[in-house]
Interface confidence: low
């Protein structure tokens, strides 16, 4: 049913879904702080532009008795329940921030006619791709897939002279929400990644993974997994690893690799870590003081969601355009806005673009070093370290198939 929006006459409201099931186990209080900090900035920016309007947020909490697992896998109905709550209260803002769970977002699109913009810190799955009124402020699975295919095909760098066409994917079902959907996308029989690879096998058991590390009959030298170094250590321990094995560890939302005093443990020497380029002003901000490095991106996405709304509101008000229109709902894409930590670019489908960073462990310094960066906006790789001090022979990445290339 159509719900009237609190979104006119100089008063503009943001509906923030505070869901028990969330992509990251972040206390809702921290998300509230992020939203409130964003509101302060938006009010200041609008005032500076000579726009004398009110911007507020309404936090909508779901019934903790029903939705209390905290697990995205059981989140399917929670978003719909919250929408019903909004509908019953006749209290919908100009924009909806949340949910972050892929199942929840997907279901809300299936079961509702969304005529207002929806901003998500999450919704990583491919099933949330190409949604006309959805904006995603954390890197979705599609962006990861495009990096991997680009990197696999690259064969003209001093440290990577072979195209790869094979991979193992380790996926045991206990992953965090982001990893779950990243790996789902890689596993999917119909996806860009699967389509571009000649061989791909999913390893589901710890023992399968452990056996591959020294299996002379393995079909690929490359293993993709998702999580932090501790997750890898729990799985791999100090087991011997064949010298031409390359583990790609996807750990996008983790700034710890860039901290000054971090030393790479020995078990990381066969590993390339894929993460996001870290922000620079977050460490001292009031909202992020209590956040771990992994949680910072989640709270930041909420904050940037508020700033994105402020950006669009400013544009529409300056142009004298109505906010409660399909044009506004569809406008949150193909743009760059001033985020909390610098410019944020959204692609044609409203998904955040970012700089991904591939790190290696220097055998000399035992530090993580940047091997290359990848700009998701232009799907292009930029080498950084032309003569890396790799553990692999000749300081080159091996071929992906044993017996073809440096062993």
């Amino acid at each position: 049913s159509q719900v009237s929006q609190n979104c006119h006459n100089g008063s503009y409201e943001i509906s923030v879904l505070m869901m028990g099931n969330s992509a990251f186990a972040e206390p809702l209080k921290n998300l509230e702080d992020a939203v409130n900090e964003g509101l302060e900035i938006v009010r200041g920016r609008l005032q500076n532009a000579g726009l004398n309007v009110t911007v507020n947020a309404t936090f909508m909490y779901s019934d903790g008795l029903i939705h209390n697992s905290g697990d995205c896998r059981s989140s399917t109905c929670e978003g719909l329940d919250l929408l019903r709550k909004i509908s019953n209260a006749q209290r919908m803002g100009c924009v909806l921030i949340g949910p972050s769970c892929t199942y929840s977002t997907f279901q809300m699109y299936l079961d509702t006619e969304l005529s207002y913009p929806m901003i998500s810190a999450g919704s990583f799955g491919l099933s949330c791709d190409y949604k006309e009124t959805l904006t995603r402020l954390m890197s979705p699975a599609r962006k990861l897939m495009y990096f991997l295919v680009n990197f696999w095909k690259t064969n003209d760098l001093p440290f990577k002279t072979y195209s790869w066409s094979t991979s193992y994917v380790y996926k045991n079902g206990t992953e965090t929400e982001d990893c779950f959907w990243y790996l789902n996308a890689l596993e999917a029989s119909v996806s860009y990644f699967s389509h571009e690879l000649g061989f791909k096998v999913v390893l589901r058991q710890d023992k399968e993974f452990q056996d591959i590390l020294m299996d002379h009959n393995r079909k690929s030298n490359v293993i993709i997994m998702c999580g932090g170094p501790e997750f890898l250590y729990k799985l791999k321990g100090d087991r011997a690893v064949a010298e031409d094995i390359v583990i790609i560890l996807v750990d996008l939302f983790n700034d710890q690799y860039f901290e000054d005093n971090v030393t790479a443990p020995d078990y990381m020497k066969n590993v390339l870590v894929l993460t996001l380029s870290p922000g620079n002003s977050l460490l001292n901000s009031s909202f992020s003081r209590n956040l771990s490095p992994t949680k910072r991106d989640f709270a930041l996405a909420y904050l940037n969601g508020i700033l994105l709304f402020g950006h669009m509101l400013k544009i529409f008000l300056e142009n004298g355009e109505n906010i409660t229109t399909p044009k506004f709902a569809h406008a949150f894409r193909n743009l760059t806005f001033e985020g909390y930590d610098g410019p944020v670019t959204l692609d044609d489908w409203g998904d955040v673009d970012s700089t991904m960073v591939l790190l290696y462990t220097s055998v000399d310094t035992k530090k993580y070093k940047v091997l290359l960066t990848y700009d998701t906006h232009v799907n292009k790789t930029y080498p950084v370290d032309m003569s890396p001090t790799f553990t692999w022979k000749n300081s080159k990445l091996p071929n992906d198939i044993t017996g073809r290339g440096p062993q």
């Epitope: 079961d111 491919l126 791709d129 190409y130 789902n184 996308a185 029989s189």
Partner: nanobody, 119 residues
Framework: EVQVVESGGGLVQPGGSLRLSCVAS????????MGWFRQAPGKEREFVAA????????YYGDSVKGRFTISRDNAKNTMYLQMNRLKPEDTAVYYC????????????WGQGTQVTVSS
């Protein structure tokens, strides 16, 4: 979950053309990836083609690239497979499938439509 029904199969000579259709129930059609698979007698099911909800992403199996074209009309809740330059080895039961793009497998399958390529 959507329900899907295929049509358009039949007997065609080598080098000929055929157009398969797949109609899906429900107004949420554009939220689903759709795909075509085929199974010849005594063989494993083979991926033919797939298309994302918006039509923005399209994939083809190696054996049909350049000959088959997948498309969809979200206003009509219908997906199509235009098959040109058909070969005897294209003979199979063709299945339409639907599912959220990125799920490891499609979760809704049709009953199939028989395509026979023979002179």
């Amino acid at each position: 979950e959507v329900q899907v029904v295929e049509s358009g199969g039949g007997l065609v000579q080598p080098g000929g053309s055929l157009r398969l259709s797949c109609v899906a129930s429900g107004r949420t059609f554009s939220s689903y990836a759709m795909g075509w698979f085929r199974q010849a007698p005594g063989k494993e099911r083979e991926f033919v083609a797939a298309i994302s909800g918006s039509g923005g992403s399209i994939y083809y199996g190696d054996s049909v690239k350049g000959r088959f074209t997948i498309s969809r009309d979200n206003a009509k809740n219908t997906m199509y497979l235009q098959m040109n330059r058909l070969k005897p080895e294209d003979t199979a039961v063709y299945y339409c499938a639907a599912g959220p793009l990125g799920s490891p497998d499609f979760d809704s399958w049709g009953q199939g439509t028989q395509v026979t390529v023979s002179s």
